[in-house]
Amino acid sequence: SHTLPVHFLQPSDIQKIVEELQSLSKMLLKDVKEDKGVLVSQNYTLPCLTPDAQPPNIIHSPAIRAYLKTIRQLDNKSVIDEIIEHLDKLIFQDAPETNISVPTDTHECKRFILTISQQFSECMDLALKSLTSGAQQATT
């Protein structure tokens, strides 16, 4: 599914992908929040920025994709497919798969989806902030 390894992507290309992911993450979170009475859980943590947070490896794309793929097993909002496709563009071909256990309890499923969706949306905000501040530093 990878046309080019991620290290061939220009910083501007990465920024476009992250901008798109930010927009999609907001859509996902908006829909997930329609399910009233579900609370965020402290049991799940989505990895976000890499230690250096520099392009091309600005975010933990393989781990984030693994979490989104887990959500995809539980939920068929088509925006999730699109998010996964965009994350694919930010992943090295040899990236190892992260294993995530799927919640089995109905309510816990909903909490997992809400928690990860919220963290993913926040993560995309952080990633974009990091990219834009990095781009500003590069031009000064």
């Epitope: 829909d31 329609e34 097993q73 068929n76 909002k77 088509s78 925006v79 497919d81 909903k110 989806i113």
Partner: antibody, heavy 124, light 110 residues
Amino acid sequence: QSQLVESGGGRVQPGGSLRLSCAASGFSFSANYWICWVRQAPGKGLEWIVCIYIGSRADTYYAPWAKGRFTISKDNSKNTVYLQMNSLRAEDTATYFCARFSSGIYDLDRFFLWGQGTQVTVSS
Amino acid sequence: AFQLTQSPSSLSASVGDRVTITCQASQSIDSWLAWYQQKPGKPPKLLIYQASKLASGVPSRFSGSGSGTDYTLTISSLQPEDFATYYCQTYYGGGHIGWGFGTGTKVTVL
């Protein structure tokens, strides 16, 4: 009591067009489910046509054979989903059902809801 | 293209018999499978969803099992009102699979 009511069926000549409506009552068009059109020709099985997502984006998915001639749309203010059918052929003669399907595997059976169907006959 | 293969297409059985209907998907559908019963002139009635969950009001003689690509509907002891046509359906959604129905299994009196 949640229900779906189809209307707009009838007799139409080959090559003609028809617009079916699926009105939802007892629930609102908020996020997290799909509304689909399914048809059943006389004495035949169920055949999926198209689905539309009720959420922040009106994503649509068509059966490959339905692309081009059939178009799904929705009007949130009227809580209604439509199926526009063009260039109708004799083989489109069927009962057309609209149905609501869950978006989450964790959802309960109440998310599955079918209308009674509307009859479409394509004949000269 | 994605396909759901249901078998058998028809079967004859007697009241009290155990009946098994299978549904095979051409790719994994992660348990996004429902089973319906349909009688002439009526819309389908949900029996099983999420591959194995019994819909409310459905008798416990109906059960569903399976995962990945292979799924089964079992009627443990066929009753007179169970003579009907049964369909499996995936509601996985998304662009890679979409929705779809099995070809149906007509259960008639032996």
